[in-house]
């Protein structure tokens, strides 16, 4: 039994890091393998992650971690019984994929303005809380070409757009994702989408 693709890990910079790897053949990850991990820290202890299958030869492990700080470094040991298959390390702050924003809501009761709000996925004591920026994706269910991205580069988790920038009388969907420039993170997954019917009063034409 050998590792074909070495484990690569990403952290949510909060409490979970996800490591994925591939074996050289079909493997029952949960019964055959164990990923041991330990924070390099005087008061830390070793933890064991039981991997799950991720395709025939692929494995994935969700590591429960202490609150992440920038200096953290974890040792990783992949075992098959008594055999050490791979040994490595992982700095969570260098491989961050933020959590997805939640509670996306479209407020349509403001006159001819759409207000989209969502929740920051981090608690205020987390470093990323004040460092996230967002991308909002709005698209028409009727017209695949009617697809747009709004970059929200301020910290407030909201976006205002004129309802008239979208077509009236049809349904739209929106979703939002996050990233943090400070840690050069990847984008988060998209939030669940929310749907609304766009309607607004057309201005009277002057003849």
């Amino acid at each position: 039994m050998k590792v074909l693709q070495e484990p690569t890990c990403v952290s949510d910079y909060m409490s979970i890091s996800t490591c994925e790897w591939k074996m050289n053949g079909p493997t029952n990850c949960s019964t055959e393998l164990r990923l041991l991990y330990q924070l390099v820290f005087l008061l830390s202890e070793a933890h064991t992650c039981i991997p799950e299958n991720n395709g025939g030869a692929g494995c994935v492990c969700h590591l429960l971690m202490d609150d992440v700080v920038s200096a953290d470094n974890y040792t990783l040991d992949l075992w098959a019984g008594q055999q050490l298959l791979w040994k490595g390390s992982f700095k969570p702050s260098e491989h961050v994929k933020p959590r997805a924003p939640g509670n996306l809501t479209v407020h349509t009761n403001v006159s001819d303005t759409l207000l989209l709000t969502w929740s920051n996925p981090y608690p205020p004591d987390n470093y990323l809380y004040n460092h996230l920026t967002y991308a909002v994706n709005i698209w028409s269910e009727n017209d695949p070409a009617d697809f747009r991205i709004y970059n929200v580069t301020y910290l407030e988790p909201s976006l205002r757009i004129a309802a008239s920038t979208l077509k009236s009388g049809i349904s739209y969907r929106a979703r939002v994702r996050a990233w943090a420039q400070c840690y050069n993170t990847t984008w988060s997954e998209w939030s669940p989408s929310t749907k609304w019917h766009n309607s607004y009063r057309e201005p009277f034409e002057q003849h």
Epitope: S15, V40, F41, L42, L43, S44, E45, M65, D66, D67, V69, S70, A71, D72, P123, P124, D125
Partner: antibody
């Protein structure tokens, strides 16, 4: 807002015992290492003890065998049981949250050791 | 045990001046594990700088940290009245644990 609220200081005779408490809020207590740091009157800061998320502990040589650090994650609380107290243990004791450094501090509680 | 020595013991300056505080370690310290704190009379210390040069949340940019190995510096570019206090450096070592310097008092001249 992160808060650490301390209680339990006071006057004790040499050789006596005292238990300090520290209640945390505004953060996930169970995912954070916690510490006690003290400051003798007019002196600098001295690390006393620390406890990891899994319960691993460490002590300064000056208190080893006399002080015991513990935590109750269900109550978001940190404790320091101090036995066989000496005059040199007299200080303001701070609880702190952190790891390699201390991000947040309690308000401090004075422990006076005097006959 | 790693010993941290801070200098000067007292720094007498006027508001608006630049303050440079030194922290020297008896052996090499990882940049990642060097921090600075501010303490005012009757108050708990407050984290200013971690990782030798990163400002803690809410700390004004007039505070900056630098250095590596055994020599570290805290600089206050332009002293404000609220900056007069005692400053401590602190290090963490995987085997020796946590130690503080003895402190530098920044007082009004």
């Amino acid at each position: 807002e992160v808060q650490l609220v301390q209680s339990g200081g006071g006057l004790v005779h040499p050789g006596g015992s005292l238990r300090l408490s520290c209640a945390g809020s505004g953060f996930t207590f169970s995912r954070n290492a916690m510490f006690w740091v003290r400051q003798a009157p007019g002196k600098g800061l001295e690390w006393v003890s620390g406890i990891g998320t899994g319960g691993a502990t460490s002590y300064a040589d000056s208190v080893k065998g006399r002080f015991t650090i513990s935590r109750d994650n269900a109550k978001n609380s940190l404790y320091l049981q101090m036995n066989s107290l000496r005059a040199e243990d007299m200080a303001v004791y701070y609880c702190a949250r952190g790891r390699y450094w201390y991000n947040n501090w309690g308000q401090g509680t004075l422990v006076t050791v005097s006959s | 045990e790693i010993v941290l020595t801070q200098s000067p013991g007292t720094l007498s300056l006027s508001p608006g001046e630049r303050a440079t505080l030194s922290c020297r370690a008896s052996q090499s310290v990882s940049n990642s594990y060097l921090a600075w704190y501010q303490q005012k009379p009757g108050q708990a210390p407050r984290l200013l700088i971690y990782g030798a040069s990163s400002r803690a949340p809410g700390i004004p940019d007039r505070f900056s940290g630098s250095g590596s190995g055994t020599d570290f510096t805290l600089t206050i570019s332009r002293l404000e009245p609220e900056d007069f206090a005692v400053y401590y450096c602190q290090q963490y070592d995987h085997s020796a644990g946590w130690t503080f310097g003895q402190g530098t008092k920044v007082e009004i001249k």
